[in-house]
């Protein structure tokens, strides 16, 4: 019968020739009077059999991550008589894996969303490296994640690569970030491979900023000869937050002469002070209102931010009208 | 913190006309919203409102002196000024320089007060 | 114009006693606009109450203003040896105009 190990052979092995291991049969006394063969894909081209001993040799670098195994055919013939020894006979050898492949990271780009303020922990996204080295082959394909750049905003969880909010962060101090990853095989043993990859992470808005007035005063005009529903100038607040967030709503805060009223142009965001009643500059001349401004949509989570409405004051004066 | 500081001459001839400055300091007379006024007070005898300007030049006067009165602004050099004209012995009085409040037409901030006194 | 008359003319009292001056309006004024000033001689009028109970910045607590229509008070709880000087009132919506002031001395 036929004798011989399981044949392995290393992968990207520069020697021109490389030892693999030997095929025999047991009817083979070492004489000389066998003479082997080899057929299948890559017999004679990638690998050669010493006819008289059964040696077998690969004499091309092979790549495991294009072919991991070849399944040839042995002959073992009597040259006296020319006919078969033993069977023909299929047998295997495996290409065995060497870490040559570094981890990458298949679907990039990443880009992620996720609203700012966010407690610690919160997850972002998750990236997956991917090695084309054997999984089963020691730690050639086992994964290892860090964070390169993103401290102190961001974390990596090592072995699933799931990144996580480790400090709150304000859009409007800084509304994107750019986090680098490197995944590294050999579970970060020497000779390990790495790759990295950049993922994109914008902060959305939340409403943590109240509207605040740009003037604490404003100097306002109107003539005692202007009908009720005039509008006499505008106020307005500005407000970091940005879409529905900065959208706000202005009201008087305190008018004793129940003279005037705020009404808000939406469009614009400003504040329009509007004449409620009409105004006699002989009866009064001087009038000083506070108006005050908030936002229109306020989660109750997020009322903590807008405890205080801001106010300004609006001093207006009445211009004096001939009367006939 | 605004300071204010009256100048100008001590003593005016009847009929003449009385003029005054005042210089601003810790803050611009061209501030949104602020009014910048004249008080004076006869010696002994109680406050009378002159009238204000706005760094804008829109200025307003007090009825009884307003065909006497009037109050510029010179805001390159935070300064605004009263002429009173045809002044009588009645109009000797300390003159003061005021602005008004944040919150309301009242007098937050004044000067010290400079004496005019009217006389031949 | 509105006239505001200040009562009484003087008040004399003593030092830790309670002072209670008055300022009566010609015609109807919004409490929003009426102050209260202290003068001592040789200086200028320094505004204590506006509105007509806000005190103004640095202003003791001991100072509290209050009224609405034509009637408002200005009420020093505990005399202070400071405090004794004249007092105005202003009114502020109608032009401007002050009282004639009430003097608080020491008795």
């Known amino acids: 019968g036929w004798v011989w190990n399981q044949f392995f052979v290393p992968e990207e092995m520069n020697t021109t020739s490389h030892h693999i291991g030997q095929l025999r049969s047991d009817l083979d006394n070492g004489n000389n009077s066998f003479q082997y063969k080899l057929l299948g894909a890559g017999a004679g081209s990638t690998f050669i059999i010493d006819e008289r001993t059964g040696d077998i040799y690969a004499i091309q670098k092979l790549d495991r991550e294009e072919r991991s195994l070849y399944i040839l055919r042995a002959q073992v013939i009597d040259i006296a008589t020319g006919r078969a020894v033993e069977p023909e006979s299929e047998f295997v050898i495996k290409v065995s894996d060497i870490n040559d492949n570094e981890p990458k990271f298949l679907d990039e780009p990443y880009e992620a969303i996720v609203p700012e303020m966010s407690p610690e922990g919160t997850l972002v996204i998750q990236v997956t490296a991917s090695d084309a080295d054997d999984p089963s082959s020691g730690n050639n394909a086992r994964l290892l994640y860090s964070l390169l750049q993103g401290q102190p905003y961001f974390s990596v969880e090592p072995t699933t690569g799931v990144i996580r909010i480790s400090s709150k962060m304000d859009r409007e101090l800084q509304d994107e970030y750019w986090v680098i990853i490197q995944a590294k095989d050999m579970i970060g043993q020497p000779g390990a491979l790495s790759g990295t990859t950049s993922v994109l992470i914008k902060l959305s808005d939340v409403n943590d900023n109240k509207p605040i007035f740009k003037e604490s005063l404003y100097r306002l005009t109107v003539s005692e000869s202007a009908p009720t529903g005039t509008s006499i100038g505008t106020i307005m607040a500005y407000d970091n937050d940005i879409g529905e967030n900065a959208e706000m709503d202005y009201s008087i805060e305190e008018d004793d002469s129940q003279t005037f009223d705020i009404i808000t142009n939406h469009e614009t965001q400003e504040g329009i002070v509007i004449l409620k009643k009409k105004v006699d500059f002989e009866h009064q001349n001087h009038y000083g209102i506070r108006a005050k401004v908030k936002n229109h949509h306020v989660p109750e989570q997020l009322m903590k931010y807008h405890t205080e409405a801001s106010t300004t004051f609006i001093k207006i004066q009445v211009e004096d009208v001939d009367e006939p | 913190q605004v300071q204010l500081q009256e100048s100008g001459p001590g003593l005016v001839k009847p009929s003449e006309t009385l003029s005054l400055t005042c210089t601003v300091s810790?803050?611009?007379?061209?501030?949104?919203?602020?009014?910048w006024s004249w008080i004076r007070q006869p010696p002994g005898k109680g406050l009378e409102w002159i009238g204000y300007?706005?760094?804008?030049?829109?200025?307003y006067y007090n009825p009884s002196l307003k065909s006497r009165v009037t109050i510029s602004v010179d805001t390159s050099k935070n300064q605004f000024s009263l002429k009173l004209s045809s002044v009588t012995a009645a109009d000797t009085a300390v003159y003061y320089c005021?602005?008004?409040?944040?919150?309301?037409?009242?007098?937050?901030?004044w000067g010290q007060g400079t004496l005019v006194t009217v006389s031949s | 114009e509105i006239v505001l008359t200040q009562s009484p003319g003087t008040l004399s009292l003593s030092p830790g006693e309670r002072a209670t001056l008055s300022c009566r309006a010609s015609?109807?004024?919004?409490?929003?606009?009426l102050a209260w000033y202290q003068q001592k001689p040789g200086q200028a009028p320094r505004l204590l109450i506006y509105g007509p109970s806000s005190r103004a910045t640095g202003i003791p607590d001991r100072f509290s203003g209050s009224g609405s229509g034509t009637d408002f008070t200005l009420t020093i709880s505990r005399l202070e040896p400071e405090d004794f000087a004249v007092y105005y009132c202003q009114q502020y919506g109608s032009s401007f105009t002050f009282g004639q002031g009430t003097k608080v001395d020491i008795k």
């Open positions: 005021a602005r008004d409040g944040s919150s309301g037409w009242y007098f937050q901030y």
């Open positions: 300007i706005y760094y804008t030049g829109s200025a």
């Open positions: 015609r109807q004024i919004s409490s929003s606009y």
């Open positions: 810790g803050g611009s007379i061209s501030s949104s919203g602020y009014y």
